[in-house]
């Protein structure tokens, strides 16, 4: 039912995050007269769209409209009718669609076209659907968390208590893990960013920021698992893959055609003497970790230092917010506490992975088996990526903060995206020209 009370002097915005594994709709709200203040925008709703990511609709584009209906209807309920026409709607697609575009630009365009037509049917101010770059995804995630932590302004924030010791203006780095890609973004300490592709310069609220960012396509948790399976099946002696990243007693049949469907496994593709193989879990953290490390090429680095695969990475600096799947996985494993050391996380993972599958299913009866079965891999992957990939150490681990929400708003790229596209991040303090969209492209 519509709210008939006097309209508040507020504005709304909607962003759809079309990720590789699912789509989420976020509704943001802010006081109309304080558009250019930092910290005034906050999330009022999240609606998770039922079903997979939009890239999976490539053979059934006619179903996209129905797929988006529930969450768009929810937005209609939450936002007062009087505000509908002036509420902007943006859809940003991330690495799942980047991968589809690599396979076929035509197919990716077809999906986006149907998405746009579906979203145009609603009474909101639809501003378009596009595939955002990995650089944008990293940058907007960094903007989101620092905006919510009040890092861009000395002024009083709209919320009273800011978490994570944010009494200084030193920005947080952003660590984002999705299903198909992962992003690392931070301000390095007095360090030249040796690779221009990884450098962003922008001016926010009167201050200049030189930001490092990189998005590793195919290194999101789901695509990393496909990569690992494709790598390991190469050396399997038959159609049984004894996999240390799954619990002892776990079994699952995988179609080779599914394995090689993604561009992420192309480098491991070979003609196998079988169409299917069976994963048999053996639950060994150490072996799982070793297998994952083989996905990171650390032997080649054309810069002073690299993350992996020859990608420049400056020395880590300051505190980091780790969100999206970094948070969801660690939260499930009960490892998000600031007090849990890296050594303790490793010990817990060893124990968790070694637990028999039947025991795990009983302990977590309410969790879907598909997700439940992959937490051992995902937790081990997170450790491998952070320690070996990004060079966090036992020391710097304590400066990683696993963040789900900050003052009620989800950590992720969507808020930063909307702030930028609605010109709500002024370059100057208090008000001047907004950060141009082209800054990121």
């Amino acid at each position: 039912t519509q709210n008939k009370a006097l309209p508040e002097n507020v504005k709304y915005g909607i962003v759809l995050d079309a990720g590789s594994s699912h789509t989420s709709l976020y509704i943001y709200k802010w006081p109309a007269e304080k558009e250019n203040d930092t910290g005034v925008v906050h999330q009022v709703e999240e609606c998770r769209v039922k079903g997979p990511g939009i890239s999976k609709f490539v053979q059934k584009v006619n179903e996209i409209g129905i797929y988006l209906t529930d969450c768009m209807e929810r937005a209609r309920e939450v936002i007062p009718r009087s505000q509908h026409q002036e509420t902007p709607v943006y859809l940003g697609a991330t690495a799942g669609m980047r991968l589809l575009r690599m396979e076929s630009e035509e197919l990716a365009d077809r999906v986006l076209d149907v998405v746009e037509r579906s979203l145009s049917n609603y009474p909101f101010d639809f501003q378009g659907a596009r595939i955002i770059t990995g650089q944008e995804e990293g940058a907007y995630g960094w903007i989101t968390i620092n905006y919510l932590l009040g890092k861009f302004s000395q002024k009083t924030r709209w919320f009273s208590i800011v978490p994570y010791e944010t009494n200084n203006q030193e920005t947080f780095g952003a660590l984002d893990l999705g299903g198909a890609s992962t992003q690392v973004t931070f301000v390095p300490q007095n360090q030249t960013i040796e690779s221009p592709d990884n450098a962003l310069q922008f001016r926010l609220y009167g201050k200049d920021y030189n930001v490092y960012t990189h998005s590793f396509l195919c290194y999101g948790k789901d695509q990393a698992l496909w990569q690992k399976l494709a790598k390991d099946i190469q050396v399997a002696s038959n159609e049984i893959l004894r996999d240390p990243c799954f619990h002892p007693g776990y079994k699952k049949v995988v179609n080779v055609s599914d394995l090689y469907k993604t561009p992420c496994t192309k480098r491991f593709e070979m003609t196998l003497p079988f169409q299917q193989f069976e994963i048999q879990g053996i639950g060994n953290y150490q072996q799982c970790h070793q297998s994952i490390l083989e996905l990171f090429n650390t032997s080649y680095c054309p810069y002073s230092q690299c993350a992996f695969n020859g990608i420049f990475l400056p020395p880590l600096q300051g505190d980091f917010g780790a969100f999206s799947a970094f948070y969801f996985v660690m939260k499930f494993l009960n490892l998000t506490s600031e007090k849990v050391s890296q050594e303790k996380v490793t010990e817990m993972m060893k124990k968790f992975c070694a637990q028999p599958w039947e025991e795990i299913k009983t302990s977590y009866a309410g969790v879907k088996e598909k997700y439940l079965s992959e937490y051992c891999f995902s937790g081990t992957y997170i450790l491998s990526l952070l320690l070996q990939g990004y060079h966090f150490t036992a020391d710097s681990w304590e400066h990683i903060h696993f963040i789900g929400k900050i003052q009620g708003s989800d950590a992720g790229w969507t808020l930063g995206y909307m702030l930028n596209l609605t010109n709500m991040i002024p370059a100057e303090q208090p008000l001047s020209t907004p950060l141009s969209h082209s800054t990121y492209v």
Epitope: Q189, N190, Q305, H391, T393, A394, D395
Partner: antibody
Framework: SVEESGGRLVTPGTPLTLTCTVS????????ISWVRQAPGKGLEYIAI?????TTYYASWAKGRVTISKTSSTVDLKISSPTTEDTATYFC??????????????WGPGTLVTVSS | AYDMTQTPASVEVAVGGTVTIKCQAS??????LAWYQQKPGQRPKLLIY???SLASGVPSRFSGSGSGTEFTLTISGVQCDDAATYYC????????????FGGGTEVVVK
């Protein structure tokens, strides 16, 4: 650069403070470690204070030494030196958290002799 | 603790020869290992960081390899100036620094 000072001849039990003075970089961005070397022996790690002011000690040093910092100096206080503490004491700069990328900048060292 | 065991304690090598020094960590330290050179009466000098990255100004005849628990420093085409003691050091955890340096390897150049 980093430079140690305060090394001298002391009698056992006489408290001693060594100072590491830094220039050209900020202690809010880097960690400082203290390392010592007894005559003719190898390097021995003593303690570290990271950019956040968090301190860590080798287990043998806990209770015997204290590391602290100001804006441009890092002190190592040896509360009750024994003859075993005779060594050259070095301070060295690591990365912001510790020595994850090695100790790239070392002072020349300061000699402490403990003798009765 | 992350105990570091360095071998050999001493090695003799002819000018132009190759010397290999090994360092073993008691636990996985990933790539967080540094190598230092120290000459008598001098301060240590960083040669290699993160197991295989050459520090600024270090000649390319020095190279590092390994990850996890096994690491190697190799000096190819040894020169007289390379006579020194070499130390490895784990840079993974400050919380466990009881034996963060290896015992050292003395390289004698003939």
């Amino acid at each position: 650069s980093v430079e140690e000072s305060g090394g001298r001849l002391v009698t056992p039990g006489t408290p001693l403070t060594l100072t590491c003075t830094v220039s050209g970089f900020s202690l809010s961005s880097y960690a400082i470690s203290w390392v010592r070397q007894a005559p003719g022996k190898g390097l021995e790690y003593i303690a570290i204070i990271n950019s956040y002011g968090t301190t860590y000690y080798a287990s043998w040093a806990k209770g015997r030494v204290t590391i602290s910092k100001t804006s441009s100096t890092v002190d190592l206080k040896i509360s009750s030196p024994t003859t075993e503490d005779t060594a050259t004491y070095f301070c060295a700069r690591g990365d912001s958290y510790g020595s994850g990328v090695g100790l790239g900048l070392w002072g020349p060292g300061t000699l402490v002799t403990v003798s009765s | 603790a992350y105990d570091m065991t360095q071998t050999p304690a001493s090695v003799e090598v002819a000018v132009g020869g190759t010397v290999t020094i090994k360092c073993q960590a008691s636990q996985n330290i990933y790539s967080n290992l540094a190598w230092y050179q120290q000459k008598p009466g001098q301060r240590p000098k960083l040669l290699i960081y993160r197991a295989s990255s050459l520090a600024s100004g270090v000649p390319s005849r020095f190279s590092g390899s390994g990850s996890g628990t096994e690491f190697t420093l190799t000096i190819s085409g040894v020169q007289c100036d390379d006579a020194a003691t070499y130390y490895c050091q784990q840079g993974f955890s400050s919380n466990n620094v009881d034996n963060t340096f290896g015992g050292g390897t003395e390289v004698v150049v003939k």
